[in-house]
């Protein structure tokens, strides 16, 4: 779990115990084994919007 | 600072078990990714699989008949057995870490930033 | 697999010159729910273990100089090094690590006139 008083993971990524870090849910792709990919499946990943001037 | 040490026969008979350990020294095991690669006379790479130090493995679809990797997380190791060698498999074999990277506190793999100093296998009666 | 093609397979410059190299994906290497393309840059000089030089195409690994760019997006790539040093003579490979099997380059090879 993580560590209490620390701020969440933002949208997309989910938290590594292993690491001690907030890891891209991306990185479930290739590996769905990392110890945080359990949470990434809960969420679904943000969206990635362009900005245009 | 992290540093892999590659071990292993240098020499290995056809059709046998090429056998090869990783040590890591220094810096966090846990978490990260080991993976071994190879390279061909020629300088071809190609990798060849990896594992984390729960035993979770991705490995060349190429050799997954042939390829076992495994982990002692206790000393700080892993290992490669390829089954059933030929002459092509002949080659300086390398292990490395998979990197881990942040931008804006979202971290993510990165690339191979550590490597071993490689350890050349010739297969050859 | 995805296929990694490089471009040119080797290239003689002085030093002080410009150079660039190409690397093209068989299908996109771009994760469009983090627009990052998951492609790496690697320099392997004579007798030595390859070295990360770029991740993320574009970023640099720490302590590697500014003359080394990466570039590019989706599946075409591409390594410059501004101002060529006599210690840049190496082979430069790519590689892809969107999927498994992760796949390299056959290299271009750096050579000094």
């Known amino acids: 779990e993580q560590a209490p008083g620390t701020a969440p993971c933002s949208r997309g990524s989910s938290w590594s115990a292993d690491l001690d870090k907030c890891m891209d849910c991306a990185s479930c792709r290739a590996r769905p084994h990392s110890d945080f990919c359990l949470g990434c499946a809960a969420a679904p990943p943000a969206p990635f919007r362009l900005l245009w001037p | 600072d992290v540093q892999l040490q590659e071990s292993g026969p240098g020499l290995v008979k056809p059709s046998q078990s090429l056998s090869l350990t990783c040590a890591v020294y220094g810096g966090s095991f846990s978490g990260y990714y080991w993976s071994w690669i190879r390279q061909f006379p020629g300088n071809k790479l190609e990798w060849m699989g990896e594992?984390?130090?729960?035993?979770?493995?991705n490995s060349n679809p190429s050799l997954k008949s042939r390829i076992s990797i495994t982990v002692d997380t206790s000393k700080n190791q892993f290992f490669l057995q390829l089954n059933s060698v030929t002459t092509e498999d002949t080659a300086t074999y390398y292990c490395?870490?998979?990197?881990?990277?942040?931008?804006?506190?979202?971290?993510?793999?990165?690339?191979?930033?550590?490597w071993g100093q490689g350890t050349l296998v010739t297969v050859s009666a | 697999d995805i296929v990694m093609s490089q471009s040119p397979s080797s290239l003689a410059v002085s030093v002080g010159e410009k150079v660039t190299m190409s690397c093209k994906s068989r299908q996109s290497i771009l994760y469009s729910s983090n627009n990052k393309n998951y492609l790496t840059w690697y320099q392997q000089k004579p007798g030595q273990s390859p070295k990360l030089l770029i991740y993320w195409a574009s970023t640099r690994e720490s302590g590697v100089p500014d003359r080394f760019t990466g570039s590019g997006s989706g599946t075409d790539f591409t390594l410059t090094i501004s101002s060529v040093k006599a210690e840049d003579l190496a082979v430069y490979y790519c590689q892809q690590y969107y999927s498994t099997p992760y796949t390299f380059g056959s290299g271009t090879k750096l050579e000094i006139k």
């Open positions: 594992i984390n130090h729960r035993g979770s493995t």
């Open positions: 490395a870490r998979e990197g881990i990277s942040g931008s804006m506190g979202i971290y993510d793999y990165s690339g191979m930033d550590v």
